[in-house]
Interface confidence: medium
């Protein structure tokens, strides 16, 4: 079944997906696409990347992390109700049939009606935890502040829910990775 | 739609500092990279600087020392300052929006504001 | 070099097909985009990544790129089409923007 994520109307959603460059430099295509992966390619394409750079993006979807090292994760800008669904990441590993796929559920919440204080500064100022991400080479390993314990599903739901948040990067473990080559 | 107006001392001596405003309207702005581009008469297009909702900035390394770019996110807004200005900048400056909304996207300028000739001259 | 060298001057007649070139190190890991700039305005955004077209700009207008070299290909070009056009992409540390020095188009 599919990973869920989760963001309120208005905010950014961020679906995450990465994969291990066998070389620095040495881009494997991906696509994103609405709906569930197909047997070939992705359909409905919302973002497409190939062995040089982003060559096809639509207007709000984007990638905010470092794709040339791997880090394929979909922001999803102003999101609505229409945006819930499975959104499908395809890593277009060289090779018949070698496509990693993974299908990603975005729940799209009604906005709150009454603001809540900030969270991300309440989020981030309260957490006494580190993590650490893997399969990008050297761990990264960051202090996040100090909360008490909670589960990387719970982290991620939270992060969804962070306008532009900040943590995206130190959130890769809850996403689907794939270390290539 | 998106527009960018922009404004500024038109008329500077050298020496002096060159300051420029873009309000933004009609579109989000904290999704974006916003840059500052100028255009000397006769000759191409030079990027000069880039700013977003938050305060990351990036530099042309050939005017870093001069520049200096600020957002005021509470009026959509952002700034260009150069200083020591010398005939040399004189040119027009555009602002535009990059749709570069990532550290590593792509960088197209979708968006331009109408320009603003500014001329050094003693 | 992180520069990006165009062309200064290329010319097509009327309803011919033009290509206007871009080459730089950089260009081997970035796409470029291409811009359309008249006299007193400010340039217009062509072409973006790959091959894609802004709304609004005529399907005569097309990107492709190979190697160190982007290109801009204009089929059937119009008269409205006489500007100069500017390359712009990422330097070759990925850091700064850079734009090429321009290319005056001349519709004959």
């Known amino acids: 079944s599919e990973v869920e994520y989760r963001a309120e109307v208005g905010q950014n959603a961020y679906l995450p997906c990465f994969y291990t460059p066998a070389a620095p430099g040495n881009l494997v295509p991906v696509c994103w696409g609405k709906g569930a992966c197909p047997v070939f390619e992705c359909g409905n394409v919302v973002l497409r990347t190939d062995e040089r750079d982003v060559n096809y993006w639509t207007s709000r979807y984007w990638l905010n992390g470092d794709f040339r090292k791997g880090d394929v994760s979909l922001t999803i800008e102003n999101v609505t109700l229409a945006d819930s669904g499975i959104y499908c990441c395809r890593i277009q590993i060289p090779g018949i049939m070698n496509d990693e796929k993974f299908n990603l559920k975005l729940v799209i919440k009604p906005a709150k009606v009454t603001p809540a204080p900030t969270r991300q500064r309440d989020f981030t100022a309260a957490f006494p935890r580190m993590l650490t991400t893997r399969g990008h080479g050297p761990a990264e390993t960051q202090t996040l502040g100090s909360l008490p314990d909670i589960n990387l599903t719970q982290i991620s739901t939270l992060a969804n829910e962070l306008r532009d948040s900040r943590l995206a990067n130190d959130l890769r473990d809850s996403g689907a990775t794939i270390r290539i080559g | 739609q998106v527009q960018l107006q922009q404004w500024g001392a038109g008329l500077l001596k050298p020496s002096e500092t060159l300051s420029l405003t873009c309000a933004v309207s009609g579109g989000s702005f904290s999704g974006y990279y916003w840059s500052w581009i100028r255009q000397t008469p006769g000759k191409g297009l030079e990027w000069m600087a880039e700013i977003n909702h938050s305060g990351d900035t990036d530099y042309n390394p050939s005017l870093k020392s001069r520049v200096t770019i600020s957002v005021d996110t509470s009026k959509n807004q952002f700034s260009l300052n150069l200083t020591s200005v010398t005939a040399a900048d004189t040119a027009v400056y555009f602002c535009a929006r990059g749709s570069r909304r990532g550290r590593y996207f792509p960088q197209p300028f979708d968006f331009w504001g109408q320009g603003t000739l500014v001329t050094v001259s003693s | 070099s992180s520069e990006l060298t165009q062309d200064p001057a290329v010319s097509v007649a009327l309803g011919q097909t033009v290509r206007i070139t871009c080459q730089g190190d950089s260009l081997r890991s970035y796409y470029a985009s291409w811009y359309q700039q008249k006299p007193g305005q400010a340039p217009v955004l062509v072409i973006y990544g790959k091959n894609n077209r802004p709304s609004g700009i005529p399907d005569r207008f097309s990107g492709s790129s190979s190697g160190n070299t982007a290109s801009l290909t204009i089929t059937g070009a119009q008269a409205e089409d006489e500007a100069d056009y500017y390359c712009?992409?990422?330097?070759?540390?990925?850091?700064?923007?850079?734009f090429g020095g321009g290319t005056k188009l001349t519709v004959l």
């Open positions: 712009n992409s990422r330097d070759s540390s990925g850091n700064h923007v850079v």
